[in-house]
């Protein structure tokens, strides 16, 4: 059992989630990568890269784009036009076989809320960021894309148990919660 810190990101409808999943290029440069959502106890693969991975060869599935950079050990994931129903727990995995997917840490808890007046949120209207939160509260340090200076905290020691086939992952200390307005 591996303990992971889940990071929670809050977006408004219509915004774009952009994450990077880091991997050991010497081990996984030529492996397929996938973006999955936890639905109940079973992960649902939403998109996966081609085999073998090629630099700058994006794969698009609906609103999701995956771009693998094997030279850099990074997978870029973009989910555009976020909807409330996109909320949930997501993770990048090395897709070796449907029954053996190696999880790339950390899982991301995506929370999508309705924009004010029902309009999509925009980072252009809000330029402050929690990124500058004092370093004494390390758990509150956010990414550069942020707007309100507030950081919502999850209940202490909340635990989510998710599983990929053949493994069980306990997500404890779900405290890294960040508001992240990103471009439409």
């Amino acid at each position: 059992t591996t303990e992971l810190t889940e990071e929670k990101y809050e977006y408004k409808e219509g915004q774009t989630l952009e994450v990077k999943c880091d991997y050991a290029l010497e081990k996984y440069a030529n492996s397929r990568k996938a973006w999955q959502k936890m639905e109940g106890k079973m992960p649902k693969i939403l998109a996966k890269t081609e085999r073998p991975s090629e630099n700058s060869h994006p794969v698009q599935v609906g609103r999701i784009t995956l771009e693998d950079y094997p030279d850099h050990g990074l997978l870029q994931v973009r989910m555009t036009n976020l909807q409330v129903e996109d909320s949930g727990l997501y993770q990048c995995v090395i897709y070796q076989h449907p029954k053996e997917s190696h999880v790339l840490f950390n899982p991301i808890c995506l929370v999508v809320t309705k924009g004010s007046s029902g309009t999509p949120g925009s980072s252009e209207n809000s330029t402050q960021n929690v990124y500058r939160t004092p370093s004494t509260t390390a758990k509150a340090l956010g990414p550069r894309y942020t707007s309100p200076r507030t950081v919502t905290q999850a209940p202490p020691e909340s635990t989510v148990v998710v599983s990929t086939p053949g493994s069980e992952i306990n997500l404890t200390n779900v405290t890294d919660i960040i508001r992240v307005p990103v471009f439409n």
Partner: antibody
């Protein structure tokens, strides 16, 4: 406050290696990527690659692959960049820079080290 | 790789002048563009991130705009302390690339 402090200037002979250090303070070292950027005298900025201090995973620009290694020691919040098989054209100021949070697609360099001049000369 | 073309490469303006620098990407980079200021012998300093967001502590005379392939950096009223080289940087795709720089001098 956030600070990145780099090691001092180095003079190396062609074919040798150099290892530059970058000590971070004032933030959680493992939460943000460390990037390395170099600048030859009178030239522009050139990104060399990045390292995730949490995982230790690194990636390098093609021009440097096979010659550069980026590592870290989390116990002392220090990142390292080693460049081998040095040639005269590697003479430059080497900077470490804090990038975006490790999980977000952001390469915004908000804090930089003071730079380390590496001179390669026979 | 994405090429970033900055223009002009140098300019000379008077104190109080409005200064505009452009940066053109060889392909669409959305709003993934940052601007840095670099003074001689010093490390670059972040001024603008994500095209138009002013970094904390940076004077409001600096601004940025654009989207896609064409971006603009503006100093609304040039000050003597603004003498420096200004660089754009894209991070839409790897490898990250910088513009060639624009050297700003006072007339």
């Amino acid at each position: 406050q956030v600070q990145l402090v780099q090691s001092g200037a180095e003079v190396k002979k062609p074919g040798a290696s150099v290892k530059v250090s970058c000590k971070a303070s004032g933030y959680t070292f493992t939460s943000y990527d460390i990037n390395w950027v170099r600048q030859a005298t009178g030239q522009g900025l050139e990104w060399m690659g990045r390292m995730n201090p949490k995982s230790g995973n690194a990636g390098y620009v093609q021009n440097f692959r096979g010659r550069v290694t980026m590592t870290r020691d989390t116990s002392i919040s220090t990142a390292y960049m080693e460049l081998s098989s040095l040639r005269s054209e590697d003479t430059a100021v080497y900077y470490c820079a804090r990038g975006g949070r490790t999980s977000i697609w952001s390469f915004v360099f908000d804090y930089w080290g003071q730079g380390t001049l590496v001179t390669v000369s026979s | 790789d994405i090429q970033m073309t900055q223009s002009p490469s140098s300019l000379s303006a008077s104190v109080g002048d409005r200064v505009t620098i452009t940066c053109q990407a060889s392909q669409d980079i959305s709003k993934h563009l940052n601007w840095y200021q670099q003074k001689p012998g010093k490390a670059p300093k972040l001024l603008i991130y994500d095209t138009s967001n002013l970094e904390t502590g940076v004077p409001s005379r600096f601004s940025g705009s654009g989207s896609g392939t064409d971006f603009t950096f503006t100093i609304s009223s040039l000050q003597p302390e603004d003498i420096a080289t200004y660089n754009c940087q894209q991070y839409d795709k790897l490898p990250l690339t910088f513009g060639g720089g624009t050297k700003v001098e006072i007339k």
